[in-house]
Interface confidence: low
């Protein structure tokens, strides 16, 4: 019968001829009376056999990532009779892996959006690298992820590539971050190859800023001839948030006389002071009212940022009109 061990050949061998192993018949007594032949894809071009001894050699550099095994056939013939000594047999040559491929991030570019002020541990995105080397061959394709840029705001789980928040971020200070992740094979041991990717992380706004009046005191005037409903002036607050998180509502906090009202212009986000009751210079020639401003939409979990609404004082002077 045929005698052989399993055949392995390392990929990327630079030698012109690399001995892989020996194929022989147990009837071969070593007197050179048998002839060994190799058939199949790669026979003669990639692999050759010593016709006398059955020794097999690789004569070309192999790439496991291109082809990881070769199925060949072997024959042994009695030179004297020309007849087959053993039935033709199929055997396999496996190409063993070396660490010749760096990890690659295939889903680039990465982009993620996460709410500002998210707590530590919040998941941002998972990045995944692929390594063409053999995952079953040692650590050649076992990857470890690390953060090259992005501290102290982000961290990456070494084995999963999951990026998490490690420190609260304020969109009003910086609204996007570039994070650079490295994937290293060989679980980071010597001889490891690496690849990197960039992740653009954008912070979405949350309502963590309350509106604040631009002025702590406003001065307005109203003519005693002004009809009810007259707009006598505007007040304005600013909010560092954006979009609906910056929409605000103005209201009267204090007006003992119940003479004025404030409505909100939702397009300009201004407060419009309105005359609710006619005024009479002879009766009262100045008024003091206090206004407050609050955001229109505040989720309950963000109310902590909105305790104590911003207030302002409005002094209103009544202008005298000569009466006939």
């Amino acid at each position: 019968g045929w005698v052989w061990n399993q055949f392995f050949v390392p990929e990327e061998m630079n030698t012109t001829s690399h001995h892989i192993g020996q194929l022989r018949s147990d009837l071969d007594n070593g007197n050179n009376s048998f002839q060994y032949k190799l058939l199949g894809a790669g026979a003669g071009s990639t692999f050759i056999i010593d016709e006398r001894t059955g020794d097999i050699y690789a004569i070309q550099k192999l790439d496991r990532e291109e082809r990881s095994l070769y199925i060949l056939r072997a024959q042994v013939i009695d030179i004297a009779t020309g007849r087959a000594v053993e039935p033709e047999s199929e055997f396999v040559i496996k190409v063993s892996d070396i660490n010749d491929n760096e990890p690659k991030f295939l889903d680039e570019p990465y982009e993620a959006i996460v709410p500002e002020m998210s707590p530590e541990g919040t998941l941002v995105i998972q990045v995944t690298a692929s390594d063409a080397d053999d995952p079953s061959s040692g650590n050649n394709a076992r990857l470890l992820y690390s953060l090259l840029q992005g501290q102290p705001y982000f961290s990456v789980e070494p084995t999963t590539g999951v990026i998490r928040i490690s420190s609260k971020m304020d969109r009003e200070l910086q609204d996007e971050y570039w994070v650079i992740i490295q994937a290293k094979d060989m679980i980071g041991q010597p001889g490891a190859l690496s690849g990197t990717t960039s992740v653009l992380i954008k912070l979405s706004d949350v309502n963590d800023n309350k509106p604040i009046f631009k002025e702590s005191l406003y001065r307005l005037t109203v003519s005693e001839s002004a009809p009810t409903g007259t707009s006598i002036g505007t007040i304005m607050a600013y909010d560092n948030d954006i979009g609906e998180n910056a929409e605000m509502d103005y209201s009267i906090e204090e007006d003992d006389s119940q003479t004025f009202d404030i409505i909100t212009n939702h397009e300009t986000q201004e407060g419009i002071v309105i005359l609710k009751k006619k005024v009479d210079f002879e009766h009262q020639n100045h008024y003091g009212i206090r206004a407050k401003v609050k955001n229109h939409h505040v989720p309950e979990q963000l109310m902590k940022y909105h305790t104590e609404a911003s207030t302002t004082f409005i002094k209103i002077q009544v202008e005298d009109v000569d009466e006939p």
Partner: antibody, heavy 119, light 107 residues
Framework: QVQLVESGGGVVQPGGSLRLSCAAS????????MDWVRQAPGKGLEWVAV????????YYADSVRGRFTISRDNSKNTLFLQMNSLRVEDTAVYYC????????????WGRGTLVTVSS | EIVLTQSPGTLSLSPGERATLSCRAS???????LAWYQQKPGQAPRLLIY???SRATGIPDRFSGSGSGTDFTLTISSLEPEDFAVYYC????????FGQGTKVEIK
């Protein structure tokens, strides 16, 4: 380990000043809003002041507004309470407390430091 | 400001008994914004319950919270020797206010 340690308490005369400190360790101090809560001898708990994680906003109880100032140094992981114009009724154990990220109840407290205002 | 009133002021019970502590608010408190703390003599308060009914990390399941609106309850199903302490409720929806405390003492 995760802890808060207050210091700076002592005996002071009415009208005097004291500065309390609270040293934080074992957690990312700069990520948390921090508060001072006090407890008069044999009495209940009273909230005093809060400062946001970055120091940008501060709020005070009516009883101390204008007299007490809360501040923090994130580079030194330390919270402060500057107490001026002290009154006898300010006598209490002062605790620093950490607010949670997802709410604003207090999940970590120090052991407290005693402030006694007495003539 | 929201005023919290705790009752009873003192609760005298034996180990193994059930303790029921009440906290009443002067105006409605969203149940998301009520916490319970335990305090032993000479020690800092310790968070037990938040959001009216969620147990804090490491708190045994004999402690439970319930209630909504203006009435809230802390229940200790079977008192252990280490549970004898003062318990405070706290609302944190409108500034921060605490109840005056309930002392649970050994009978």
């Amino acid at each position: 380990q995760v802890q808060l340690v207050e210091s700076g308490g002592g005996v002071v005369q009415p009208g005097g000043s004291l500065r309390l400190s609270c040293a934080a360790s074992g957690f990312s101090f700069s990520s948390y809003d921090m508060d001072w809560v006090r407890q008069a001898p044999g009495k209940g708990l009273e909230w005093v002041a809060v400062i946001w994680y970055d120091g940008s906003n501060k709020y005070y109880a009516d009883s101390v507004r204008g007299r007490f100032t809360i501040s923090r140094d994130n580079s030194k992981n330390t919270l402060f309470l500057q107490m001026n114009s002290l009154r006898v009724e300010d006598t209490a154990v002062y605790y620093c407390a950490r607010e949670t990220g997802e709410g604003w109840y207090f999940d970590l407290w120090g052991r407290g430091t005693l402030v006694t205002v007495s003539s | 400001e929201i005023v919290l009133t705790q009752s009873p002021g003192t609760l005298s019970l034996s180990p193994g008994e059930r303790a029921t502590l009440s906290c009443r608010a002067s105006q409605s408190v969203s149940s998301s914004y009520l916490a319970w703390y335990q305090q032993k003599p000479g020690q800092a308060p310790r968070l037990l319950i938040y959001g009216a009914s969620s147990r804090a990390t490491g708190i045994p399941d004999r402690f439970s919270g319930s209630g909504s609106g203006t009435d809230f309850t802390l229940t200790i199903s079977s008192l252990e020797p280490e549970d004898f302490a003062v318990y405070y409720c706290q609302q944190y929806g409108s500034s921060w206010t605490f109840g005056q405390g309930t002392k649970v003492e050994i009978k």
